[in-house]
């Protein structure tokens, strides 16, 4: 034979070719990509598993058949050589023998050769048939294994991608949880700080309550003494009146009474010639009821009625509805003039409102509203403002449209919480809104990060508590 070739065909099957004389025998064996022999190194992310026993068996049998084939091929080669040798010898004999015997001998030899060749061909055909059957079975089995492996690999890939997705989701959730934990810790710290502040406030309030209780006891004692003194005085006055009526019965009883000049606001006081800063007595519109107010007769042309002042934290602004209605504090220091008076006054004519602010760094600013009035008590002294100008922010720190007034005992804000209790002080709270000039007073360097301080958001931000504030009103036509 000429050669023995082992190669790969185009569809990935292993090809065995045996060339024997003019005859060529070709065996095609399947070799799938995912089925590797143990000798070939192959790394895969697929799950490793044992090869099916049946498959190993078939491979072994195929190897045996290959060996048989090779032996047969060897045997045929030997046979061919033997025939050629014999033919040479016989050819010599034939040449030596008589010419007449030559044709008969030739025919006999040819017949022998043909018989032997036919026998070998039959054997080879049987072997080929066996090999083809075996390879077909192997092809089917390998195909099944390949399909099963592909299916498994697909499942594994699906599971891997699912695991990756879950891992991504898990890491995302872990980050989220960590972020929430951080946020939670910050919130807890903030709550703890607020709690500490509240505890400090509560303990302070307790001591104030104790002091007040003592004062009440003293006041009660003083009151009973005063009542006795008053009673005695009344008796003396009655006696004097009796004496006077008896001794001066001939005289004219009419007494000339000095006419009392009353002022509605500081603008009227200013126009009457009083141009000095100070405390003046004002009269409620259409009433004889009086109220003391501080008049600023110098700033911006004078005539300003001060309706609120904060400067040193000496007055507690966490007051009741009634206290904010009638006013409290000291007009020469920290005070609130009173919602009822301001409401009545600002509904008589048009007023402007000026809010003057000071921070702890020596800066000053103001907000001026060209029209200001308060609704009546029935409408919770709602604030109405128009036309903002000034240096304390381009946006109004008093929420627009105006809100109702709220106090610790009169919750009229837009929050489910109680802004007045939480932020302290009475104010026109929204929910809770960007300002509160009646908040807790905090001194220098302790005035930042204070949620319940004296706030004017659009000038100093939310956590900054101001040093001083003044709210003042004046007629628009002054």
């Amino acid at each position: 034979y000429n050669n023995f070739r082992k190669s790969m065909d185009s569809i990935g099957k292993k090809q065995y070719q045996v060339q024997h004389g003019s005859c060529s025998y070709t065996f095609l064996l399947p070799e799938m990509d995912n089925c590797r022999s143990s000798s070939s190194p192959y790394v895969s992310n697929a799950v490793q598993r044992d090869a099916p026993l049946e498959y190993d068996d078939s491979v072994q049998r195929l190897q045996v058949l290959e060996n048989i084939m090779e032996n047969n091929t060897q045997w045929l080669m030997k046979l061919e050589n033997y025939i050629q040798d014999n033919m040479k010898k016989e050819m010599v004999e034939i040449q030596q023998n008589a010419v007449q015997n030559q044709t008969a001998v030739m025919i006999e030899i040819g017949t022998n050769l043909l018989n032997q060749t036919a026998e070998q061909t039959r054997k080879l055909t049987d072997v080929e048939a066996q090999v083809l059957n075996q390879t077909t079975r192997l092809e089917l089995q390998l195909l099944e294994h390949s399909l099963s492996t592909n299916k498994l690999e697909k499942q594994i890939l699906d599971q891997t991608s699912e695991i990756n997705k879950l891992q991504d989701k898990n890491s995302f959730l872990e980050k989220k949880v960590l972020a929430m934990e951080d946020k939670h810790i910050i919130q807890l710290q903030s709550i703890k700080e607020e709690k500490d502040q509240l505890q400090v406030l509560v303990s302070k309030q307790n001591s104030i309550i104790e002091e007040l209780e003592k004062k009440i006891v003293t006041a009660t004692v003083n009151n009973s003494v005063l009542q006795k003194q008053q009673h005695d005085l009344m008796e003396t006055v009655n006696n004097l009146l009796t004496m006077m009526s008896t001794s001066n019965s001939a005289k004219d009883p009419t007494v000339a009474k000095e006419e009392q000049i009353s002022f509605r606001d500081c603008a009227e006081v200013f126009k009457s010639g009083h141009t000095t800063n100070g405390i003046y007595t004002l009269t409620f519109p259409n009433s004889t009821e009086e109220i003391k107010a501080y008049c600023d007769m110098e700033a911006g042309g004078g005539g300003w009625t001060i309706i609120q002042r904060r400067e040193d934290g000496s007055v507690d602004f966490q007051r009741t509805w009634k206290e904010y209605k009638v006013g409290f504090g000291n007009p020469s220091g920290e005070y609130w003039l009173g919602n009822e008076f301001v409401s009545q006054l600002t509904n008589q004519q048009r007023y402007v409102l000026k809010i003057h602010l000071k921070d702890w760094e020596g800066n000053e600013a103001y907000s001026l509203y060209e029209h200001f009035y308060l609704s009546s008590e029935e409408l919770n002294y709602r604030i109405h403002l128009k036309g903002l100008t000034g240096t304390a922010g381009k946006i109004s720190s008093i929420s627009q449209p105006g809100n109702d007034f709220s106090t610790k005992d009169g919750d009229n804000d837009k929050c489910i919480c109680k802004c007045s209790q939480m932020l302290t002080g009475g104010w026109w709270f929204d929910a809770c809104g960007p300002s509160n000039l009646n908040g807790m007073y905090y001194p220098q360097r302790q005035n930042t990060n204070k949620f319940n301080g004296i706030k004017w958001y659009y000038w100093k931000g939310s956590g900054y508590s101001l040093k001083a504030t003044t709210m003042m009103i004046r007629p628009a036509d002054f």
Epitope: D312, S314, T424, Y441, P443, R445, K450
Partner: antibody, heavy 119, light 111 residues
Amino acid sequence: EVQLVESGGGLVQPGGSLRLSCAASGFDFSRHWMSWVRQAPGKGLEWLGEINPESTTINYAPSLKGRFTISRDNAKNSLYLQMNSLRAEDTAVYYCARPGDDFIYFDSWGQGTLVTVSS
Amino acid sequence: DIQLTQSPSFLSASVGDRVTITCRASKRVSTSGHSYMHWYQQKPGKAPKLLIFLASNLESGVPSRFSGSGSGTEFTLTISSLQPEDFATYYCQHSWELPWTFGQGTKVEIK
């Protein structure tokens, strides 16, 4: 645990200069105001000045008349006091102190470093 | 500057005694919410230690025999039952406005 450790003290001649350091640990130094306080031998406590976390605000006691400078390096967790034109009356133990978060009481102090101004 | 005056400057007492130290400010250092006065204890060779903050709040880890009170301009530190480890110098400090100042100190000695 909050720890403040002063260093840099020693003997210096009148008119001389000295730079004190305060190494902070156990808290987020970059979030806190810091102060310097001194105590002359047998005398009371005297607050010298303070610096805010960003070094944008520094407040001094009026008595120092610009001779002392407070600075800080947040990356090194360190506070500094540069003292110039030193006088005999500057002899004292110098403390760095941390005020509380919300109110100015000093809840953490260093052990102090002694500065002696003498010829 | 706000001046703080402590009285007495020296105080001799025995273990178990009730001791009261006063601190007067030259200006009001209280609001309706807080009193900005704080108390410290200092032992020889040591740094001061915070006892009371905002007039009446006990610093954590400080024994309950220490208490503070007062508002406005007058404040007191009270030790209900003096212990051997309480013999030291006590200082008040305000935080109403810059500069922060300390009292001159009250030295509590063993009688």
